[in-house]
């Protein structure tokens, strides 16, 4: 996260008109003092002295943890996933007790054939990762299994996974309707009982960048927001430059307070600046007003 570089000036004046010396400390910010041994340091906002410097808690930084960062690191997962709990009834295999033992040759063979069959069924779904048999039971063989889906994180990941789960439902319904026994014989890799196909549960990865941003911003949660760049979420305050929500302080420095972002205007040798965005410049010598 980029911190705003302070402007090199004699003083900064807030947009309300008061002169504030740098580095500025927002008087509304809660102040705590951290003491380690006989070393007393003014580490504010929950920061602690490590013997050399203040270790600041998010979202603070600075020598005394008095300033608020302009952006907070939020790290969405690289990939997001969904797990569908399904049940199908395989009629081309008769149940035997050995199928309950996951280390038996029967189970291993069934698992291999079932996995092959499902890989064929779901071959057109880019999010499809594989299947995992959780339980086999009598009737001919009732197969309780998970279908695993995965996709790269994007802001639209939920829609992508929701769509994929719908395609899984369509495809499993189709194959279990088409691949059925004829004259007690199966000509397909596996045959199914059409009525035995059920979707028991769907679990989708929950990740909300807005929620993570708000949590990390703590008492500044109302002023930090999420903006996207190249499908990646950024948790920023208006003081972070280069975003749609960025505040333009023109001739001044943006600073966060508990009332939101404000501009601290520059006073130079020739001008002083005022206004909410420090865009009103007054020349000192001629008292001439520029816009």
């Amino acid at each position: 996260p980029l911190a705003t570089i302070p402007v090199s000036t004699t003083s900064l004046t807030s947009s309300e008109g008061s002169t504030i010396s740098t580095p500025s400390v927002d008087i509304s910010t809660p102040v705590t003092t951290s003491i380690v041994g006989d070393q007393c340091s003014r580490c504010k906002n929950g920061g602690f002295w490590d013997g050399l410097k203040c270790q600041c808690l998010t979202p603070y930084y600075g020598e005394s943890c008095e300033e608020v960062v302009n952006s907070i690191d939020i790290a969405p997962p690289e990939t997001v996933s969904a797990q569908m709990e399904l049940t199908v009834t395989v009629t081309s295999v008769k149940f035997t007790d050995e199928l309950k033992n996951h280390s038996s040759q029967e189970f291993r063979e069934f698992n291999k054939t079932f996995t092959e069959q499902m890989n064929i069924v779901y071959s057109g779904i880019p999010e499809y990762v594989g299947v995992n048999i959780t339980n086999l039971r009598l009737g001919s063989v009732v197969v309780e299994h998970d279908v695993l889906l995965r996709t790269k994180y994007t802001p639209e990941y939920k829609t992508a996974l929701d769509n994929a789960t719908e395609v899984v439902k369509q495809k499993i319904t189709k194959v279990t309707t088409e691949q059925i026994m004829t004259n007690d014989n199966c000509s397909a890799l596996m045959c199914f009982n059409t009525t035995g196909t059920q979707v028991q549960n769907i679990t989708v990865t929950q990740y909300d960048p807005v929620e993570e941003c708000r949590q990390k911003a703590e008492e500044y949660e109302d002023y930090f927001l999420v903006e996207y760049r190249d499908q990646k979420p950024y948790c920023i305050s208006p003081c972070e430059s280069g975003f749609n929500a960025s505040k333009n302080c023109n001739h001044g420095k943006c600073q966060m307070s508990q009332n939101g972002a404000r501009c601290l205007c520059v006073t130079t040798e020739t001008h002083w600046y005022s206004g909410e965005d420090c865009n009103q410049g007054t020349q000192k010598s001629h008292h001439h007003h520029h816009h």
Epitope: E106, E116, D184, N185, S187, A188, C191
Partner: nanobody
Framework: EVQLVESGGGLVQPGGSLRLSCAAS????????MSWFRQAPGKEREGVAI???????GYADSVKGRFTISQDNAKNSLYLQMNSLRAEDTAVYYC?????????????????WGQGTMVTVSS
């Protein structure tokens, strides 16, 4: 390790009979299934007959009433008695085994295979 070895193939006249055998090792006949498949030149492998440890037998429509599948558990052997043979029965005949009690004559459903024995029906 499952090993299957077929024998009994050869040249026979149309209308004649032939008995194929398959000796199995590493496989128990009292569990799972065994089957016969065949592959004619330039064609896909197709199911001929199947027998399961629960006593169930199944046949392809093209051989029903002419072929009989059987097994001898004591000898760990599988047999295919082929009667009223036709020219279209000419193929390499394969023995296949599965630890599952199968009802499938799709070759992809079978995991263990023999090398095959050639049956030629010609006058």
């Amino acid at each position: 390790e499952v090993q299957l070895v077929e024998s009994g193939g050869g040249l026979v006249q149309p209308g004649g009979s032939l008995r194929l055998s398959c000796a199995a090792s590493g496989f128990t006949f009292s569990r799972g299934s065994m089957s016969w498949f065949r592959q004619a030149p330039g064609k896909e492998r197709e199911g001929v007959a199947i027998i399961s440890s629960d006593g169930w037998t199944g046949y392809a429509d093209s051989v029903k009433g002419r072929f009989t599948i059987s097994q001898d558990n004591a000898k760990n052997s599988l047999y295919l008695q082929m009667n009223s043979l036709r020219a279209e029965d000419t193929a390499v005949y394969y023995c296949a085994a599965s630890f599952l009690v199968l009802r499938a004559l799709n070759p992809k459903a079978w995991h263990y295979w023999g090398q095959g024995t050639m049956v030629t029906v010609s006058s």
